[in-house]
């Protein structure tokens, strides 16, 4: 079995993690990326990913998450502002490909969140000023695939009732043209 | 259509182990987590672990660390849960349950149960 | 381990009214990505439990409109907005934000 390479950030409450996960421009470029954290047990789960298919250089916002794909540079940048303690844990970014397993982007971001902010702005925010907020909105992330509860057989997309609204509001500085991708519940 | 189905009910002496079975059917067995969860008599749910039926991997509840061994085997679809040093405190209905998100989705909630196992515990 | 902890114990409804169940978590169940990792399942009697609600806020496949669920953070509720007579059972709010999963201690809704 491969053995599995970890980052380790170590940033405060209030910063922003920034990272950036390579893969194979040919074979990847318009492929759903996403990023899931690892729960105990080797139990991926996502969280956030990109439109299907992947945009170029579109930033999609879930919640706190940013997730952009540059094709031309073989690269997605996972951002996740105001990070909170609780959201310290094992994190990866992956390619889908179904029916089969997510393709997994080395290395995995072991983020460690602490308490009391340092006073210098995280990764990516560059001053104070400009700062807006993006409210909650009434659509989220595209990511499940599939109704459920599913069959073997193709299932049809989930409907478009019930959609709820993700509770998180961010500030950000310096991010254009963030799009909401909606999520069909 | 989706459906978890279970073994049937279980006596047990204490001290004893058990093994409950848990055959899936109408999804793809390997894309989905598998839960176990118990409920005893006239009491409320408990989460004992999860498995992952694609790997193996598996991580249970604290309580039940070192009694508790959940397996799978791919060919039949099914996923096995076996509790070791049974005592009368696990008397209890045992339920598997499936975490409606797979590899691609966001929820994690149970949207499939099984039917659920007695297994009774007495000398 | 985050604790769930649910009111009230027991509810006696009258068909066709209203009936509220409140669900509270030691640790905010709000992800990084907006959502907060809280579930609703009713436990018919002689059953195994259900999904209602997901998410929070969503109702699963096939449950009825009557069945709402909001809240965020550590506070959430589930509300029926007119009670039917099958809707009696036992209902569980659990946790998926962090391992280990929790569930709530349980709301019996019985018919008055």
């Known amino acids: 079995a491969t053995k599995l390479t970890e980052e380790k950030y170590e940033l405060k409450e209030g910063q922003t993690l920034d990272v950036k996960c390579d893969y194979t421009l040919e074979k990847f470029a318009s492929s759903q990326k996403a990023w899931q954290i690892i729960r105990d047990g080797e139990m991926p789960k996502t969280l956030a990913c990109t439109e299907r298919p992947s945009k170029n250089s579109h930033p999609v916002q879930v919640g706190r998450i940013i997730l952009e794909d540059y094709h031309d540079h073989g690269l997605l940048r996972v951002r996740m502002v105001n990070l909170q303690v609780e959201d310290s844990g094992l994190y990866q970014c992956v390619i889908y490909q179904p029916p089969k397993e997510p393709h997994m982007l080395f290395d995995r971001i072991r983020l460690v969140v602490t308490k009391g902010f340092s006073g210098t702005p995280g990764s990516n925010e560059n001053s104070t000023q400009n700062v807006y907020k993006i409210p909650p909105t009434t659509t989220k992330a595209l990511c499940p695939l599939y109704t459920s509860p599913r069959t073997v057989t193709q299932a049809p997309p989930k409907s478009t009732a019930d959609v709820s609204t993700p509770d998180s509001e961010i500030n950000l500085t310096n991010v254009t043209d963030i799009i909401r991708v909606p999520v069909f519940n | 259509q989706v459906q978890l189905v279970q073994s049937g009910a279980e006596v047990k002496k204490p001290g004893a182990s058990v093994k409950v079975s848990c055959k899936a059917s109408?999804?793809?067995?390997?894309?989905?987590?598998m839960h176990w969860v118990r409920q005893a008599p006239g009491q409320g749910l408990e989460w004992m672990g999860i498995?992952?039926?694609?790997?193996?991997?598996?991580s249970y509840a604290q309580k039940f660390q070192g009694r508790v061994t959940m397996t799978r085997d791919t060919s039949t679809s099914t996923v096995y849960m076996e509790l070791s040093s049974l005592r009368s405190e696990d008397t209890a209905v045992y339920y598997c349950?499936?975490?409606?998100?797979?590899?691609?989705?966001?929820?994690?909630?149970?949207?499939?149960w099984g039917q659920g196992t007695m297994v009774t515990v007495s000398s | 381990d985050i604790v769930m902890t649910q009111s009230p114990l027991s509810l006696p409804v009258t068909p066709g009214e209203p009936a509220s169940i409140s669900c509270r978590s030691s640790?905010?169940?709000?992800?990084?990505?907006?959502?907060?990792?809280l579930d609703w399942y009713l436990q018919k009697p002689g059953q195994s439990p259900q999904l209602l609600i997901y998410l929070g806020s969503n109702r699963a496949s096939g449950v009825p409109d009557r069945f709402s669920g909001s809240g965020s953070g550590t506070d959430f509720t589930l509300k029926i907005s007119r009670v039917e007579a099958e809707d009696v059972g036992v209902y569980y709010c659990m946790q998926s934000r962090n391992a280990p999963w929790t569930f709530g201690g349980g709301t019996k809704v019985e018919i008055k």
């Open positions: 498995i992952n039926p694609s790997g193996g991997s598996t």
């Open positions: 640790q905010s169940l709000l992800h990084s990505n907006g959502y907060n990792y």
């Open positions: 349950a499936r975490e409606a998100g797979n590899y691609y989705d966001i929820e994690s909630a149970f949207d499939i």
């Open positions: 109408g999804y793809t067995f390997t894309s989905y987590y």
